[in-house]
């Protein structure tokens, strides 16, 4: 498993992009089969980002290899049954670490897009994509979690009682010798999602609930979330009814709880509170919050929402304030521009995340040999010969001001300037004139002065005039 | 279309205040950080004041520091700009803007208001 | 802070000219510059961002190039109508700081 340039797609190039050490993660995402492959429609099917993932060193110079990716791996919960077909997309993010990083700290670097098949239960798929220079090598596979079985995990199956039959009325789970299918009628109001049978009108329950109809959560430890400590028998209790209780999203929209209340992610094509609104053109204005409309001239066909900085789902109705998480130091501007988060940083801070100091002289050095110094809470650089500006990165041209006076030519050298004195002047800047008669030269200067030759003297000192 | 209005101007003694407003349409207002921009009467531009997409976040030239204060209310869709103890110098045509950051993503419309004049003299 | 001296300060062209405008900021600004265009009594209006890249609805004949602390603003040929004010603006870090204008006057 691997990220990296791929072969014959251009000049091999880091991810790291010749800024540092930097962090990829991966963002995977599953939608229906159904689904536009290249649109930023909502993950329906479920969304996961890796965790641990090593730190990446390149340097200026070396030629870029595939990097090698961690085993970990990234889990997506599907809802529901598994379709078998869906379109899989996988983002790499870039984060760029260390102090010389400049420009935004997260890039989005490439996103595959490819619709597949698969059952549940199946062996890993191996697979390659790639998109502009990059290639990334990948396994998938779908797995049903227990009880449910079968190549769309949508049958509860249990392990026979005995090795021979299986209960009353009850077949085989076929292709799973060893279990038995649960049947289709249970007590009535028994939990679909907590609670199986084994005969007709019984509830029991999965690992982790309990109660007549398995609606009540059993705890060892302390209550999570929202629940609250119930009779000791009982572990942990729910509040009340939860908002998703019967799952008030219609048309397959997936319902999640918001403090206290519920929030629908909507499949493509409908929207409203509880996904009951069809809009499946542009004309039907389907995209929220500035979100610009894409295609979808005619019902057939699929429109997309180009969402604005902190709106993400199929019709820009998800708010995400990626800011939130203050990635910027030092009293910084994060600034969400939809592809990547900016920090913009104060007077004084540099760095992708304002993390440099640049009063303090432990933050940045002075280039071409300058010097740091401290003082009155800031820092400057003092600048060797030859050098200026704030970092002493800009080359100064001593002879830029025209210091030799009376059409003395300027000769920059390393210790500073050198001035060729046209006949009759003489001094470090030609400032005085030479009496003819042999007089003192004008103004006054000290008697027994005679005039350097600028060849001579640069040659003395090995150097070569510019 | 990104439109910006901007409104409160008017003459004011020094030492003085005076509340500007800028009124927001055509974009997800909570979303761009903003700016105050002024213009002195027959000179160049000056960055005023930013603020983040949430308010949570506020900058300031240091000209205007401890005297100005930026703010905004998302759900007015509305920028604001408190200026107290108002000198003569701060007489200018002041502008609110959409940070300039992000020029690639939003398209047409205004990205500066039109301007509202304010003017300190006795 | 970051300074942006803008050169020449005022110029005189010709129709069909070639202008170049620049802006030297006194540290790297990476391409986080852009550059606008004012009329008397008007709006500031955005030619280029990022440098180099052209506004949409802004006639080809103006183009932004440069990175670091040197940039360039071009019309490859001067129009009757780009008579006006320009100026270049920082947005690399705090504070914001603008060019002082080049004033393009006809010859």
């Known amino acids: 498993h691997s990220f990296g340039p791929g072969p014959g797609l251009g000049t091999p190039r880091s991810p790291c992009n010749a800024r540092g050490p930097c962090r990829l993660f991966f963002r995977v995402c599953l939608k229906p089969g159904v689904s536009q492959e290249a649109t930023e429609s909502l993950c329906a099917l479920g969304a996961a980002l890796s965790t641990s993932v090593p730190v990446y060193t390149e340097h200026p110079g070396e030629s870029a290899a595939a990097l090698p990716l961690p085993d970990g791996l990234v889990r997506v919960p599907f809802r529901d049954a598994w379709p078998g077909t869906f379109s899989l997309v996988i983002e790499t993010w870039r984060e760029q670490l260390g102090e010389h990083a400049g420009g935004p700290a997260w890039n989005l670097l490439a996103r595959v897009v490819g619709r597949r098949r698969l059952a549940a239960g199946g062996p890993w798929a191996r697979d390659v994509q790639r998109t502009g220079t990059w290639e990334l090598h990948f396994s998938y596979r779908a797995r049903c979690e227990p009880p449910a079985v079968g190549a769309a995990c949508a049958r509860l199956c249990r392990s026979r009682s005995a090795p021979s039959r299986c209960g009353p009325g009850l077949r085989p789970c076929t292709p799973f010798p060893d279990e038995c299918e649960a049947p289709s009628v249970c007590r009535p109001g028994c939990s679909p999602e907590h609670g199986y049978c084994e005969e007709p009108d019984e509830c029991r329950c999965l690992e982790g609930w309990t109660g007549p109809l398995c609606t009540v959560p059993v705890s060892t430890s302390s209550c999570l979330n929202s629940r609250v400590p119930g009779p000791a028998s009982t572990g942990c209790l729910l509040p009340g009814p939860g908002p998703c209780d019967g799952n008030p999203c219609a048309n397959g929209g997936s319902c999640s709880e918001t403090s206290g209340s519920f929030e629908c992610a909507c499949p493509r094509g409908f929207y409203g509170l509880r996904c009951e609104v069809s809009g499946v053109t542009c004309a039907d204005g389907p995209c929220f919050n500035g979100g610009l409309c894409v295609g979808g001239e005619d019902p057939d066909s699929a429109y997309v929402c180009h969402c604005p900085p902190g709106f993400q789902g199929s019709n820009c109705e998800k708010r995400v304030d990626r800011c939130s998480l203050q990635p910027c130091q030092n009293g910084g501007l994060c600034l969400d521009l939809g592809h990547a988060l900016r920090c913009r940083c104060r007077a004084g801070f540099a760095g992708p995340r304002c993390e440099h100091d640049l009063d303090d002289c432990a933050g940045r050095a002075c280039a071409n040999g300058g010097t740091c110094v401290e003082g009155g809470g800031s820092r400057r650089c003092s600048c060797a010969l030859g050098f200026g500006g704030r970092d002493c990165r800009e080359r100064a041209d001593p002879c830029a001001s025209r210091p030799c006076a009376h059409g003395g030519r300027c000769y920059a050298h390393f210790s500073g300037l050198v001035c060729a004195c046209a006949p009759g002047y003489m001094g470090v800047r030609c400032e005085f004139a030479v009496r003819p008669d042999g007089a003192d030269a004008v103004p006054a200067a000290p008697r027994g002065l005679r005039q350097a030759d600028p060849q001579r003297f640069l040659h003395h000192h090995h150097h070569h005039h510019h | 279309e990104v439109q910006l209005l901007e409104s409160g101007g008017g003459l004011v003694q020094p030492g003085g205040s005076l509340r500007l407003s800028c009124a927001a349409s055509g974009f997800t207002f909570s979303s761009y950080a903003m700016n105050w921009v002024r213009q002195a009467p027959g000179k160049g531009l000056e960055w005023v004041s930013t603020?983040?997409?949430?308010?949570?976040?506020?900058y300031y030239a240091d000209s205007v520091k401890g005297r100005f204060t930026i703010s905004r209310d998302n759900s007015k869709n509305t920028l604001y700009l408190q200026m107290n103890s108002l000198r003569a110098e701060d007489t200018a045509v002041f502008y609110c803007a959409i940070d300039p950051e992000y020029y690639d993503i939003l398209t047409g419309g205004d990205y500066w208001g039109q301007g509202t004049l304010v003017t300190v003299s006795s | 802070d970051i300074q942006m001296t803008q050169s020449p300060s005022a110029m005189s062209a010709s129709v069909g000219d070639r202008v170049t405008i620049t802006c030297r900021a006194s540290?790297?600004?990476?391409?986080?510059l852009a550059w606008f265009q004012q009329k008397p009594g008007k709006v500031p209006k955005r030619l280029i961002y990022?440098?180099?890249s052209l506004q949409s609805g802004v006639p080809s004949r103006f183009s932004g190039s440069g990175s670091g602390t040197e940039f360039t603003l071009t019309i490859s040929s001067l129009q009757p109508e780009d008579f006006a004010t320009y100026f270049c603006?920082?947005?690399?870090?705090?504070?914001?700081?603008f060019g002082g204008g080049t004033k393009v006057e006809i010859k």
């Open positions: 603006l920082q947005h690399d870090s705090f504070p914001l700081t």
């Open positions: 603020i983040s997409g949430s308010g949570g976040s506020t």
């Open positions: 990022a440098a180099s």
């Open positions: 540290q790297g600004i990476s391409n986080y």
